[in-house]
């Protein structure tokens, strides 16, 4: 059956923690992605950034989980207004920033 949003968010946070803690070599070979504004609609924006990373098995689960929060299909090369289009950061930093923000949302009870 449907997963409660609180459970889905907790699982996403746990996966991001797992990625950051188990990081040996540079995550996704140091690939760069567009930074995003961590506001409403950020789940789709985050996926829009990460979907452009190719051949990185470490983020496949994260991408799947983000798709559960995004109501529309996201394609490579697609960009929302939430992207900071002049700022690219490493995937590892992107994951850390996203994790910090999601932890804050979880503490505040904002599950969607």
């Amino acid at each position: 059956g449907p997963v409660p949003p609180s459970t889905a968010l907790r699982e996403l946070i746990e996966e991001l923690v797992n990625i950051t803690q188990n990081q040996k070599a540079p995550l996704c070979n140091g690939s760069m992605v567009w930074s995003i504004n961590l506001t409403a609609g950020m789940y789709c924006a985050a996926l829009e950034s990460l979907i452009n990373v190719s051949g990185c098995s470490a983020i496949e689960k994260t991408q799947r989980m983000l798709s559960g929060f995004c109501p529309h299909k996201v394609s490579a090369g697609q960009f929302s207004s939430l992207h900071v289009r002049d700022t690219k950061i490493e995937v590892a930093q992107f994951v850390k920033d996203l994790l910090l923000h999601l932890k804050k949302l979880f503490r505040e009870g904002q599950f969607n």
Epitope: E60, K61, S67
Partner: nanobody, 127 residues
Framework: QLVESGGGSVQPGGSLRLSCAAP????????IAWFRQSPGKEREWVSC????????IYSDSVKGRFTISRDNTKNMVYLQMNSLNPEDTAVYYC??????????????????????WGQGTQVTVSS
Amino acid sequence: QLVESGGGSVQPGGSLRLSCAAPRFTLGSYAIAWFRQSPGKEREWVSCISRSGGDTIYSDSVKGRFTISRDNTKNMVYLQMNSLNPEDTAVYYCATDKRSFCYAPNGLGKGWTYDYWGQGTQVTVSS
């Protein structure tokens, strides 16, 4: 685009292994999902495996009984089905959207549809 095989008739408690191949493109580059449809019912998502095989997910109805796997060197994806029961009787389809990751089956993303499908293989579980 995709070709399923391995279906057939089996008694309750039996096993089958379905295979999914893609003659026209490299299956190993993409996540692959399995669906099933029984007469008079909607198509039901069953399982998915990411491109690397590192992310595998299952519907509650098959968890613990079915195992999805892949062999990218052979360009194949498999669905091992154990402890089959009559409720598993259906046409089984594999599908892809040419993405590396699986779609969350229970989220908001109802628009996350798959564009490439096989013709299906019939699985019948009956005594």
